[in-house]
């Protein structure tokens, strides 16, 4: 299936040009999306190109500026947040990145009624997290690991927690491992729907071993960065959940929410919190051995001012074939009765589907079914449930939005997006206004991305929010590569792949092949999305064929494929890449003497193992920031898939699956190893150990480190990295510079 054919015709050939590496590094062909910042059923805010904050009313068609760029500029604001009562706006400046989601910033409060900043009782700086209550204009914020509450922006703050301490106790914000591997947020506090209560997590990292690395900076002596970071098998953070009444915070103070007994009996995690009503909350817990999850619904007891979590309101989700959930355990979406909910989990055939739980999980009513997967529940209203899936035309790498009418019986299903712009748009997400009165669709490809606004009742398109016209025009004289998404059937396994082909691809010729791999559990690389990136350039200008393959362990194709790698990371992912390469060679247009593989992070691990597989298939390869031993990576992630590195659990496979154990096998390949020295995620230690093993085995290899760079290798390092990798590949493939 040709998804993005090159627009090359002989008559035009001389006016068309190939992509250059400069195009990619400059972001010349980047696209824009439009996500409305909904403030009601029919209104949204958007930051205009000239930096005014503009309110749009869909029904009147009117728009007006609520905050001028002058006000934004006066405090160098890069972000904003309107209070639900529309009285105030917080302005965020001095953004300072910490980890993947976390950052600190300075916050100013602007009074919209008076057109001036709130003076008196200003907020301290820098703040770790700040948010408005869902109703009114109360503020909760985290400063120096403690939580504070303001009834109004100009009021003095009420301090909720006092035990916060850097790297020891975290209140209302996650520690490193919870941020990266469990919550995927910068915050760990949650307002109840009407702002009566505030729930928060406390993480105690006192006993967690610390990763320490040098940050070289510009000073005479490097700084040492210390992060409590539990590696596989190490001591984990201890988590507790508290709830405080924000109307009378001093009355009884924070009340702890009890942990279900079956969870509390051994090491456990808190995985998410969902408010149902102001007096009902749902907590999800997970055993450290992550195949048992418990969803616990708790109620406020007015008489005792405590939270009660009856055993009858505990719902257990267990996996017998792998870990609980997909990448994370899914979260519930409650219906209007405030007790029943919709949730995605595996059905009896091993496909993730939407289920409706009214009393017990055993009696769950399956809402979707088939040999495909429901991926996300966007919104449940009185009469509709909106979700995304990869059902349409049986392509796992697509995402379409569906509506199920739950108000009628039997429920009817409609695909909202399947036929809208069928060639251009096959991968969607959505953003809904209050009560799903309106919604925005954001299409990511395979054509040029487009964002549109729709009526939530009729699904009619109201207007285009962003269609990337400039990008479309800029691409008119570019020879883009061709892309195709197809599948291989091998030994009862379906291997979906994306192949990126040079613009003048000719099946009768031979091309060098580059495999780009990620391959981590519950990931997906073969997606019908638009991208003009480094591999597009390699195909367009350098005439390479690039392939991405989703093997065992990848997502959205059922549990058989997903859980195949359970407790055996580093085996089948590599095997499936190798199998695919052999199949590509059989297609007849691959030069089998010029095959390379590269990957980043988990992909660096897989590419390293593939290079060291001893197959002789690969001439060369690159590993960027690879994991080299699962003993070096984070407990929450690693143990989910590998169990514990103990003799009575899975230590043997932890030892067998290292890159170092295969050092000898790198002798006959050209290997480029790359890592940032300030990688907080996959520590430089991983590459240091690979390098040491290769040196000890007297195996030659190439390496590049990026001083003071983290796992993302951003800024000028990005340019250097891709330039360096390009030279390496061109040399490997004997392509002239």
């Amino acid at each position: 299936i040709v998804l993005r054919p090159s627009r090359v015709h002989n008559s035009e050939e001389n006016t068309m040009r190939a992509l250059t590496l400069k195009d990619i590094l400059n972001g010349t062909f980047s696209y824009k999306t439009f996500f409305p910042n909904w403030i009601s059923g029919q209104e949204y805010l958007h930051q205009s190109a000239d930096n005014n904050i503009v309110l749009y009313n869909i029904e009147t068609g009117q728009s007006y500026t609520i905050l001028s760029n002058r006000t934004m500029k006066s405090v160098n604001a890069s972000n904003y947040g309107l209070s639900p009562d529309r009285q105030f706006v917080y302005l965020e400046s001095d953004y300072s990145k910490l980890w993947r989601y976390s950052y600190t910033a300075t916050y100013y409060i602007y009074d919209l009624s008076n057109g001036e900043f709130v003076r008196g009782n200003e907020l301290p700086r820098p703040i770790q997290y700040l948010c408005w209550s869902p109703v009114g204009s109360k503020l909760a914020y985290v400063y120096q690991n403690n939580i504070y509450l303001k009834q109004r922006p100009g009021d003095p703050p009420f301090q909720i927690t006092f035990n916060g301490r850097e790297n020891k106790i975290f209140n209302g914000i996650p520690d490193w491992v919870y941020e990266e591997e469990m919550l995927a947020t910068k915050y760990a506090l949650w307002w109840s729907p009407n702002g009566k209560f505030l729930a928060y997590a406390e993480f105690n990292d006192t006993d967690i071993p610390v990763i320490a690395y040098s940050y070289y900076g510009d000073e005479q002596y490097p700084r040492t960065i210390n992060i409590p970071y539990p590696k596989a098998g190490a001591k984990n953070p201890v988590v507790r959940i508290f709830i405080i009444d924000t109307t009378y915070p001093a009355y009884v103070g924070p009340q702890e929410v009890p942990v279900p007994a079956m969870i509390a009996s051994s090491d456990y995690y808190f995985s998410w919190l969902t408010w149902v009503t102001d007096e009902r909350v749902c907590l999800q817990w997970l055993k450290r051995v992550q195949n048992v999850s418990v969803l616990s619904i708790c109620d406020f007891r007015e008489d005792w001012q405590t939270w009660d979590c009856p055993k009858t309101q505990e719902h257990i989700e267990e996996s017998r074939t792998g870990w609980a959930g997909g990448f994370f355990v899914s979260t519930p979406v409650f219906s209007y009765d405030a007790i029943s909910y919709y949730k995605i989990f595996s059905d009896k055939d091993g496909y993730k589907h939407i289920h409706y739980i009214k009393d017990t999980v055993e009696n769950a009513i399956q809402i979707t079914s088939g040999k495909w997967e429901a991926i996300n529940i966007f919104r449940v209203t009185q009469d509709s449930l909106f979700y995304s899936s990869n059902e349409f035309e049986e392509y796992p790498g697509r995402r379409n939005i569906y509506r199920i009418s739950i108000g009628s019986y039997p429920p009817s299903k409609k695909c909202v997006t399947c036929h809208l712009r069928k060639e251009r748009c096959q991968y969607y997400t959505a953003s809904f206004s209050d009560y799903a009165k309106y919604y925005a669709l954001v299409c990511y490809g395979p054509g040029i991305p487009i964002s549109t606004l729709h009526d939530g009742r009729t699904d009619q398109e109201i207007k285009i929010l962003e269609e990337n016209k400039e990008l479309e025009n800029a691409l008119k004289n570019i020879q883009l590569p061709k892309e195709e998404i197809k599948k291989l059937e091998v030994d009862e396994i379906t291997l979906w792949y994306k192949m990126i082909l040079p613009p003048q691809f000719d099946r009768s010729k031979k091309y060098p092949l580059l495999i780009q791999v990620y391959g981590g559990p519950c990931s997906q690389s073969v997606r019908s999305v638009f991208a003009v990136n480094w591999i597009s350039y390699l195909a367009s200008k350098e005439g390479m064929v690039i392939a991405l393959v989703d093997g065992r362990g990848t997502a959205f194709q059922g549990d058989k494929l997903l859980y195949a790698v359970y407790r055996k990371l580093g085996v089948y992912e590599v095997e499936d890449q190798i199998t695919a390469v052999r199949k590509f060679i059989e297609m007849g247009f691959i030069d089998e003497k010029r095959i390379a593989i590269w990957g980043w992070s988990y992909g660096g691990y897989v590419s390293s193992l593939a290079l060291a597989s001893g197959t002789g298939l690969f001439k060369c390869g690159i590993a960027v920031a690879p994991v080299s031993s699962w003993e070096y990576y984070a407990s929450v992630y690693t143990e989910r898939f590998m169990g514990l590195p103990t003799k009575d659990d899975n230590l043997e496979h932890y030892k067998n699956s290292t890159v170092m154990a295969r050092a000898e096998y790198f002798r006959n390949v050209d290997y480029l190893l790359i890592h940032g020295t300030a990688d907080d995620n996959v520590h430089f230690q991983n590459s240091a150990q690979i390098a040491k093993a290769l040196v000890n085995a007297q195996v030659d290899f190439q390496a590049m480190w990026y001083s003071d760079q983290n796992h993302g290798l951003s800024g000028l390092s990005t340019n250097h990295l891709y330039t360096h990798m390009t030279h390496f590949l061109k040399q490997c493939f004997s392509l002239s510079d």
């Epitope: 209104e43 005014n52 029904e59 009147t60 009117q62 007006y64 309107l82 057109g115």
Partner: nanobody
């Protein structure tokens, strides 16, 4: 630019009621509108808001006593004020909710609650 004309203020005993009206020239149709008030020498404060779909919101101190409503056909927004207290004494304004920038305010209407 929307022109706004407030009316209905007056002198009233504590515990009494008043109904304020705000007529917008040009169409407000289903735009969100709000009532605001200002005591001399103090900051203007928001009192109540109503969206096009008639979702209402109130500042804590007037909840249960004030009711905001609208008549789109007449381009009018109302504020029914019951059980008035002396601290409700102020000049009352209506405007877009939130106000636009640059902001346009009407003359307002004076509400005085005597005890």
């Amino acid at each position: 630019q929307v022109q706004l004309q407030e009316s209905g203020g007056g002198l009233v005993q504590a515990g009494g009621s008043l109904r304020l009206s705000c007529v917008a020239s040009g169409t407000i149709s289903s735009g969100a509108m709000g009532w605001y008030r200002q005591v001399p020498g103090k900051q203007r404060e928001w009192v109540a808001g109503i969206t096009g779909s008639r979702t209402t919101m109130y500042t804590e101190s007037v909840k249960g006593r004030f009711t905001i409503s609208r008549d789109n056909a007449e381009n009018t927004v109302f504020l029914q004020m019951n059980n008035l207290k002396s601290e409700d004494t102020a000049v009352y304004y209506c405007n877009l909710w939130p106000p636009s920038r640059p902001d346009y305010w009407g003359q307002g209407t004076q509400v005085t609650v005597s005890s």
